[in-house]
């Protein structure tokens, strides 16, 4: 099997772990939850980047 | 192509059970996760849950109370939803979507392929 | 949990003419908030994520806007096949139990006269 990693599952840079039981995402400073989408501030609505123009799988790079 | 196709609908009697399943071709689950959301007749739409099978884990809205169970069978490319104690109230049109969760690294969290649906009656 | 208050219920409009649907989320959810349209015997169909991305093949006459709590869809140069009811739906951190979850507004018929 592939590795899981390479579809860079983890957002806002988080870093991804192939685990066990799945993938684990390690969550850069400031932000939360299983694949770290949500700001650690309610009130930093501005803490989430602009999507890029389509919805289409990246580049395999981590 | 992208396809979610689900089966197991029909008629049951209240306080019965019924698992659906959903079979699901054409992309990769570590991108995508795979949310259950059902409309009852000539109704809005309703969110029950959703499994991120990367991550093994499963979602549910409040409402659920535990009468419902999400689950996957990864090998076969196959996800259930098992329904239980079922009521009137449950009588509705079941669609399994794929939810783009977080695509090269961008968090998106939009239902972008559904299913055809399966008609769920609950009656006696 | 979120509450997604969509409004209005009902809307007409002549074709050529402008629509506005408004999506009121109970809390800040950010920029995910997508929005869909569903006709009659069919699934939905998406529009927009991200409040304002338009998915693949979905005409540039749909644009998605607002953030944390308000949003808007505006449909222009309105045509007959945009008859339909559109939904929104929001994903948002549940804080009483730590996780993402779903909602759906209820819903908005457009009729196109």
């Known amino acids: 099997r592939a590795d899981p990693c390479a579809a860079r599952p983890c957002a806002h840079g988080g870093r991804c772990y192939a685990h066990f039981s799945g993938l684990v995402c390690a969550c850069a400073p400031g932000y939360m939850g299983a694949r770290c989408e949500f700001p650690v501030h309610p009130d930093g609505a501005s803490a989430l980047p602009a999507a890029p123009p389509g919805l289409r799988p990246g580049d395999p790079q981590r | 192509q992208e396809q979610l196709v689900e089966s197991g609908g029909g008629l049951v009697q209240p306080g019965g059970s019924l698992k659906l399943s959903c079979k699901v071709s054409?992309?990769?689950?570590?991108?995508?996760?795979v949310s259950w959301v059902r409309q009852a007749p000539g109704k809005g739409l309703e969110w029950i849950g959703y499994?991120?099978?990367?991550?093994?884990?499963?979602y549910y809205a409040s409402w659920v109370n535990g009468r419902f169970t999400i689950s996957s069978h990864n090998a076969q490319n196959t996800l259930y939803l098992q329904l239980n104690s079922l009521t009137a109230a449950d009588t509705a049109t079941y669609f399994c979507?794929?939810?783009?969760?977080?695509?090269?690294?961008?968090?998106?969290?939009?239902?972008?392929?559904w299913g055809p649906g399966t008609l769920v009656t609950v009656s006696s | 949990d979120v509450v997604m208050t969509q409004t209005p219920a009902s809307v007409e409009a002549a074709v050529g003419g402008t629509v506005t649907i408004n999506c009121q989320a109970s809390?800040?959810?950010?920029?995910?908030l997508s929005w869909y349209q569903q006709k009659p015997g069919q699934p939905p169909k998406l529009l927009i994520y991200?409040?304002?991305t338009l998915a693949s093949g979905v005409p540039s006459r749909f644009k998605g806007s607002g953030s944390g709590t308000q949003f808007t869809l505006t449909i222009s140069d309105l045509e007959c096949a945009d008859a339909a009811t559109y939904y929104c739906?929001?994903?948002?951190?549940?804080?009483?139990?730590?996780?993402?979850?779903?909602?759906f507004g209820g819903g908005t018929e457009v009729v196109v006269k």
């Open positions: 054409g992309f990769d689950f570590s991108n995508y996760g």
């Open positions: 739906q929001s994903y948002y951190y549940s804080s009483g139990s730590s996780y993402g979850a779903f909602a």
């Open positions: 809390q800040n959810i950010y920029s995910y």
């Open positions: 979507v794929r939810v783009a969760l977080v695509v090269a690294g961008v968090a998106y969290y939009g239902m972008d392929v």
């Open positions: 991200r409040t304002s």
């Open positions: 499994i991120d099978p990367a991550f093994g884990r499963t």
